[in-house]
């Protein structure tokens, strides 16, 4: 069976860095060379003398880890023998994925007119791992203009709700600004638009000729 | 009720810097984000940015990106604006206000710029 | 950015007189959006129509707003002198935060 080499290192090393490396024996003491063979994504390189493996681009643990990469050492001179090891770099999250809305949310609406303030939910997630606990957002509006129609509560650590400060909405759309901050080292933050349409209502759904919308708010405080 | 005390009059010389405070009271501070606007002389009302107490995020009308710079401290419920490089063109009234609720302002801080 | 014209710039105006202010926006708004404020000389602006047609408190009923989309008005119905003022319509809808010119009112 293949001989398993194994690195770990963070997904924000600077490009340059020593990674890991390889070593091989030759029964006949002859030098060897290495090749990496598989590195579909182009992160590494391997010194064909000493097998020290290097990062040439930007890793990202979000692309899938560990990074599985073959080695080829191969005798200089003589029969050119060669033997294949596998090296299984491991990269360790860094907070680098900003907050997104965790689903697409065109879909929601209010029934217009409003007779009593209304709210709706919507979640956050992002792609980095989160050890321990789950994320921990917090949630606030991306702009001081949107305070007098809208408010942002936070319910858990991924969902929140927004809620409308009066009913004087005219039937059309609403962009409301969202901040999503996930509280990590370095914190990161997202900026999220949701669109709020204010329609006209048939049983409880946005009456659109050209379809049906889907996502129902909860209406009252 | 609800107050904004700004900084007194200010006169500087062309390429110097001013900081203008606003003095915050009868409400919670890091509730309400903190509106900037300009008033030159004989012109349009100007908004120049905002800023979220709670957490100094801002907002800046691009027109006043690298001219203003928006802050808070918290512990002062104060809020701070900042104006760099000083010119002729920057001497104006310039007032803190509560968007929230759309009414409140404070009573106006003269820049005048003069060599 | 959105634009805010008003119309006239300025009217000399005689007491008991109705007086029509109109703001015209570059692009369409809600009417949630549109507010209008007074300034007197050496004092701050000050609130009289938020959400188009709100009274701002303390306001006296002769101040009434309307329009919708593109189209705003401040009207005041029966001028006092106290009314003698800059009149600013803003909108809120969109980064930056944008005004009309002023509207200037003499009272004759």
């Known amino acids: 069976s293949q001989h398993v080499f194994q690195a770990k290192v963070s997904e924000d090393v600077a490009i340059g860095t020593k990674v890991g490396n390889v070593t091989a024996k030759d029964p006949e003491g002859l030098d060897i060379s290495y090749s990496l063979r598989g590195d579909t994504r182009g992160w590494l390189k391997i010194d064909h003398v000493t097998g020290e493996i290097f990062s040439v681009a930007p890793l990202d643990r979000e692309a899938g880890s560990p990074y599985r990469v073959q080695v080829v050492a191969t005798e200089v001179g003589g029969s050119s023998l060669s033997s294949v090891s596998e090296f299984h770099l491991i990269l360790m999250d860094v907070n680098d994925n900003p907050p997104r809305l965790a689903k697409d949310y065109t879909g929601l609406f209010f029934c217009h007119p409003l007779s009593a303030p209304g709210s709706l939910i919507f979640e956050a997630t992002d792609d980095d791992q989160h050890l321990f606990r789950g994320p921990h957002f917090t949630f606030s509006l991306g702009s001081g203009s949107l305070q007098n129609d809208w408010e942002v509560s936070k319910i858990n650590g991924t969902h929140a709700r927004l809620s409308t400060r009066h009913t004087e909405f005219e039937e059309r759309e609403y962009v409301v600004l969202i901040r999503i901050n996930d509280g990590g080292r370095p914190p990161l933050e997202g900026i999220v638009s949701l669109p709020v349409t204010f329609c006209s209502c048939v049983e409880g759904s946005c009456f659109r000729p050209a379809g049906h919308q889907t996502g129902i708010p909860t209406v009252g405080m | 009720q609800v107050q904004l005390v700004q900084s007194g009059a200010e006169v500087k010389k062309p390429g110097a810097s001013v900081k203008v405070s606003c003095k915050a009271s009868g409400y919670t501070f890091t509730t309400y984000w903190m509106h900037w606007v300009k008033q030159a002389p004989g012109q349009r009302l100007e908004w120049i940015g905002e800023i979220d107490p709670s957490d100094s995020y801002a907002n800046y009308n691009q027109k006043f990106k690298g001219k203003a710079t928006l802050t808070v401290d918290k512990s002062a419920s104060t809020a701070y604006m900042e104006l760099s490089s000083l010119r002729s063109e920057d001497t104006a009234v310039y007032y803190c206000?509560?968007?929230?609720?759309?009414?409140?302002w404070g009573q106006g801080t003269t820049v005048t710029v003069s060599s | 950015e959105i634009v805010l014209t008003q119309s006239p710039d300025f009217q000399s105006v005689t007491p008991k007189e109705k007086v029509t202010i109109t703001c015209s926006v570059s692009s369409s708004i809600s009417s949630i959006h549109l507010h209008w404020y007074q300034q007197k000389p050496d004092q701050s602006p000050k609130l009289l129509i938020k959400?188009?047609?709100n009274l701002a408190s303390g306001v006296p009923s002769r101040f009434s707003g309307s329009g919708s989309g593109t189209d705003f008005t401040l009207t005041i119905n029966s001028l006092e002198a106290e009314d003698a003022a800059t009149y600013y319509c803003q909108q809120g809808s969109n980064l930056p935060l944008t005004f009309g010119q002023g509207t200037r009112l003499e009272i004759k």
């Open positions: 206000a509560l968007y929230y609720g759309y009414g409140d």
């Open positions: 959400r188009t047609s």
